[in-house]
């Protein structure tokens, strides 16, 4: 009579993670009498999955009736499979004694476990940086199998193509890690501009996962200063304006000198937005000329976003204004951002 | 008592080929179940293949194709012939009388060292 054979059919076997797998083996002849043992791995390192004979094993059941005497299907159904289950799976069949004896196994069979990946999330640098400058981005996903993925990047639906991209670990693994750095030249219209970092996996049937950053946690637009000098309002009076145009974030603080004294400070609040996602905001003086006998230099100082102050300045010349008598006094404030100079 | 002896192990350079013999003492060998076992510097034992009573034969995934076990029941000596060997193979090499149930302690020989190598 031939020897008995165990036969496990599936070389490899294929499931989603939450899924049950259902491990194949048969047996060739019901002699030598002796149980079936599952095992994931062999030798030193392997680990129970099933015994025959005795023990608990509440994520396995046999897909026929094991304990029947003439059973030659020993084929098991392994429940809410994780990536954790991936391995080698051998079907053992041992020879009844004191102790059992192992007298055969199956060639194996390979669970591979396809496990979605992560939503992939996308950081930006600490620091704001300004136009012109190159940043990077990174972009991380974990818990995937098997270990193909395919990740691109996108500025405002534009490929990039200056990204590095590295899947670990190296060797096998139960589950996998993808981590992308890319570099992003900013322009001053980035404001309302997205970096999407976009992953595509075997089992996520065509339709990849995003994640995103905003450049507007990253840019910082500097403001153009322009200080101009109105016609005269009111006898003996200028109105001087300094636009600050262009910028981004809105946190501004702007202050007046008056030959270099500080004469009002205040913070951008009432700003206009453009189009491009950038602020303007315009602060003004109404000065008194006739409380001046020179000429007054006045100076538009802005300090946005924690950086070092920019400044513009003005001269305004008292010799062309006709000085009145007794007119030293101050001129009445008719707006929120005036300011008389005495 | 079990007494297990592997030999035939030495430097090779990559794609070349080794063959280790087991020759085993104290226990019925022919009925044995019996298997190769590997453990590199620093790393932890490793299942290499084993083969039955009767010839037939289960190999563990990295080594399919390029390894072979064989025995000689008439000189209680199982084989393992070792073909496009790699640098990974480098490792002490030891058997048991055991297959796939071998525990740490089945492999009690002294082993013997291949290393791959240009």
């Known amino acids: 009579e031939e020897e008995l054979q165990v036969i496990q059919p599936d070389k490899s076997v294929s499931v989603a993670a939450g899924e049950s797998a259902i491990l194949h083996c048969t047996v060739t002849s019901l002699i030598p009498v002796g149980p079936i043992q599952w095992f994931r791995g062999a030798g030193p390192a392997r680990e129970l999955i099933y015994n025959q004979k005795e023990g608990h094993f509440p994520r396995v059941t046999t897909v026929s009736e094991s304990t029947k005497r003439e059973n030659m299907d020993f084929s098991i159904s392994i429940s809410n499979i994780t990536p954790a289950d991936a391995g080698t799976y051998y079907c053992v069949k041992f020879r009844k004694g004191s102790p059992d004896t192992e007298f055969k196994s199956g060639a194996g069979t390979e669970l591979s476990v396809r496990a979605k990946p992560s939503a992939p999330v996308v950081s930006g640098p600490a620091a704001r940086a300004t136009p012109q400058h190159t940043v990077s981005f990174t972009c991380e996903s974990h818990g995937f199998s098997p270990r193909d993925i395919t990740l691109k990047w996108f500025k405002n639906g534009n490929e990039l193509s200056d990204f590095q991209t590295n899947v670990d670990p190296v060797g096998e693994s139960v589950s996998y890690s993808i981590h992308s750095t890319a570099k992003v030249v900013l322009t001053r219209e980035d404001v309302h501009s997205q970096v999407i970092c976009e992953v595509a996996h075997v089992t996520l049937q065509g339709d990849p996962l995003r994640g995103t950053a905003n450049l507007s946690e990253t840019i910082r637009v500097p403001p153009t200063l322009e200080v101009t000098q109105q016609p005269v309002r009111a006898e003996n009076q200028v109105n001087v304006t300094c636009q600050v145009r262009k910028f981004y974030p809105q946190r501004l603080q702007l202050t007046w000198l008056e030959n270099g004294n500080v004469s009002r400070t205040e913070t951008a609040s009432t700003v206009t937005e453009n189009k491009d996602g950038t602020y303007n905001w315009m602060s003004w003086l109404l000065v008194n000329v006739s409380a001046h006998r020179d000429d007054v230099k006045l100076t538009c100082q802005v300090e946005h976003d924690g950086q070092p102050a920019v400044s513009k300045s003005h001269d305004l010349k008292v010799s062309a204004h006709p000085k009145e008598q007794g007119s030293n006094t101050a001129a009445e404030n008719t707006g929120s951002n005036e300011r008389n100079i005495y | 008592h079990v007494q297990l002896v592997e030999s035939g192990g030495g430097l090779v350079q990559p794609g070349g080929s080794l063959r280790l013999s087991c020759a085993a003492r104290g226990f019925s060998f022919r009925d044995s179940a019996m298997s190769w076992a590997r453990q590199a510097p620093g790393k932890g034992l490793e299942w290499v293949g084993a083969?039955?009573?009767?010839?037939?034969?289960v190999y563990e995934k990295s080594v399919k194709g390029r390894f072979t076990i064989s025995r000689d029941n008439a000189k209680n000596t199982m084989y393992l012939q070792m073909h496009s060997l790699k640098p990974e193979d480098s490792a002490r090499y030891y058997c048991?009388?055991?297959?796939?149930?071998?525990?740490?302690?089945?492999?009690s020989g002294q082993g013997t060292l291949v290393t791959v190598s240009s």
């Open positions: 048991a009388p055991k297959g796939v149930v071998a525990d740490e302690g089945d492999y």
């Open positions: 083969i039955y009573s009767d010839g037939s034969t």
